[in-house]
């Protein structure tokens, strides 16, 4: 089943942070406020509104056998995520155990730029992706992944670090964004919402997905993460949206079935090695790409973001397990661990496929396609 193609003229959730609406630095959202009733995390933030820092996702994936029936981003309806009528999850608490307020958190003090000034930068992540405004770049070739199918041994560390669930990856997982753009995978983590509330970091035409997986990579040009921070292309993140589907995702279940063991903040367990690529969509050829930042302090810029067009399907039960099992700081549930979308400030999102082509009669005006800057230039 394919959903109708998204329309260029569909309204975003309250405002645009697209390429055609660059904002000045003074309009950058701050990280300091927790979600408000009238500003549910599921909706696109207005430019200039306070940012809702958000949570991270766990890797969940669509079985390769379902590839044909999988959802594509350009097929999604342009409906805004409904606001949650219940009170928003309050993550802006003071830790009952005496948390040092200088350490960052999702929602609440301190403002992220106080933790790291880079969080007030002009080219931050996540962003709202508007396929109609993406620049089609034929030079963006299919992603290449090597060594992602791990044997059961050695086991991998799965950890609840209070901000997300994180799987540490061993040496040897190689990824190429293109010729001469080679990376090594370091770790993966997830961002999610809460019951009835989506929690992806990136959005598409204002639509927020239930969850999002991030696989973080270090350029082979650098030996250590610290050397790469803030350097263009020093870090690269593969991101995929997680959606609800009818069947259990067996790849994700290998991780989700272990979350109970790491329910407490700071706890960890060992899990058998698995096929990491099975946590990602099967179509490595269709994706969006832009230069942004880490989505948490230190918010270092120069990060190459690659967001898959194809989504990964998990069962409703699996998505519930993801959002309702872990605990974070101060005896609160680890939920809504996502940052609000940030203004593009003139950045152009590139697409490896013609995402802006729309044959629908609803498109009243011609689509203005942005020009492509060839990858590697």
């Amino acid at each position: 089943q394919r959903l109708p193609r998204m329309q260029e003229d569909s309204p975003l959730g309250g405002g645009s942070s697209g390429e055609d609406d660059p904002l000045g630095e003074e309009d950058l959202p701050s990280e300091e406020d927790s979600p408000r009733e009238e500003d549910p995390p599921g909706e696109e933030d207005l430019p200039g509104e306070e940012d809702l820092p958000g949570e991270e996702d766990l890797p969940e994936v669509k079985p390769k056998s379902e590839e044909e029936g999988s959802l594509k981003l350009e097929d999604l309806p342009t409906v805004e995520a409904p606001g949650d009528p219940q009170e928003p999850q309050n993550n802006a608490h003071r830790d009952k155990e005496g948390d040092d307020q200088s350490h960052w958190r999702y929602g609440g003090d301190p403002p992220w730029p106080r933790v790291s000034p880079a969080c007030a930068g002009r080219f931050q992540s996540p962003v709202d992706i508007r396929p109609q405004l993406a620049a089609f770049c034929p030079a963006l070739r299919p992603l290449e992944l090597l060594g992602f199918q791990l044997p059961p041994l050695p086991e991998l560390r799965l950890r609840n670090n209070g901000h997300s669930v994180q799987l540490t990856l061993p040496p040897g997982l190689e990824m190429a964004l293109g010729p001469g753009r080679e990376y090594r995978a370091l770790q993966l983590h997830l961002h999610w919402g809460a019951a009835g509330r989506p929690g992806s970091e990136h959005t598409v035409e204002g639509h927020r997905f239930p969850a999002e997986i991030h696989v973080v990579h270090l350029s082979t040009a650098f030996a250590r993460v610290d050397e790469a921070l803030g350097r263009p292309g020093g870090l690269a993140v593969l991101a995929a949206f997680l959606e609800e589907g009818p069947e259990e995702n067996s790849a994700y279940e290998q991780l989700l079935s272990r979350l109970e063991e790491i329910a407490e903040e700071g706890s960890e367990t060992q899990v058998p090695g698995l096929d990491i690529s099975a946590l990602l969509p099967s179509d490595f050829s269709r994706y969006f790409q832009y230069e942004g930042s880490l989505t948490t302090p230190p918010c270092a810029q120069g990060v190459i973001w690659t967001v898959f067009n194809q989504t990964v399907m998990l069962s409703a039960k699996q998505l519930h397990t993801l959002s309702d099992t872990l605990w974070g700081p101060g005896d609160s549930r680890l939920q809504l661990n996502f940052r609000a979308t940030q203004p593009l400030n003139g950045r152009v999102i590139e697409a490896s496929f013609p995402a802006g082509v729309d044959s629908s009669p609803r498109a009243a005006e011609p689509v203005q396609l942005n020009s492509c800057l060839a990858a590697g230039d």
């Epitope: 994180q166 993140v237 880490l294």
Partner: nanobody
Framework: QVQLVESGGGLVQPGGSLRLSCAAS????????MGWYRQAPGKQRELVAT???????HYADSVKGRFTISRDNSKNTLYLQMNSLRAEDTAVYYC??????????WGQGTLVTVSS
């Protein structure tokens, strides 16, 4: 962003005590969980104990009741008090700081040898 330097290792007799320290520098406010891990010769690195900013602690079963992890945020220092040491505690002990996106930061390690 974050630098970690361990100290306090050495040779101690079975049943003795040692206190390890880990001095953290850089932007440590990006870190939520810190911990101690150890690696014995020919073995995988394993968890010893972790502590969150809020003071929540976790211990490996093998050290529960003998080791205590603590942190002094005012001094940016992580500690591991090790009592009732056994020969099997002999290992290189590493300080760790974990970031949601950047992953693990590690110190250079300090050797603890328990022998009579």
């Amino acid at each position: 962003q974050v630098q970690l330097v361990e100290s306090g290792g050495g040779l101690v007799q079975p049943g003795g005590s040692l206190r390890l320290s880990c001095a953290a520098s850089g932007n440590i406010f990006i870190i939520n969980v810190m911990g101690w891990y150890r690696q014995a010769p020919g073995k995988q690195r394993e968890l010893v104990a972790t502590i969150t900013n809020g003071g929540r602690t976790h211990y490996a079963d093998s050290v529960k009741g003998r080791f205590t992890i603590s942190r002094d945020n005012s001094k940016n220092t992580l500690y591991l008090q090790m009592n009732s040491l056994r020969a099997e505690d002999t290992a290189v002990y590493y300080c760790n700081a974990n970031h949601i996106e950047l992953g693990d930061y590690w110190g250079q390690g300090t050797l603890v040898t328990v022998s009579s």
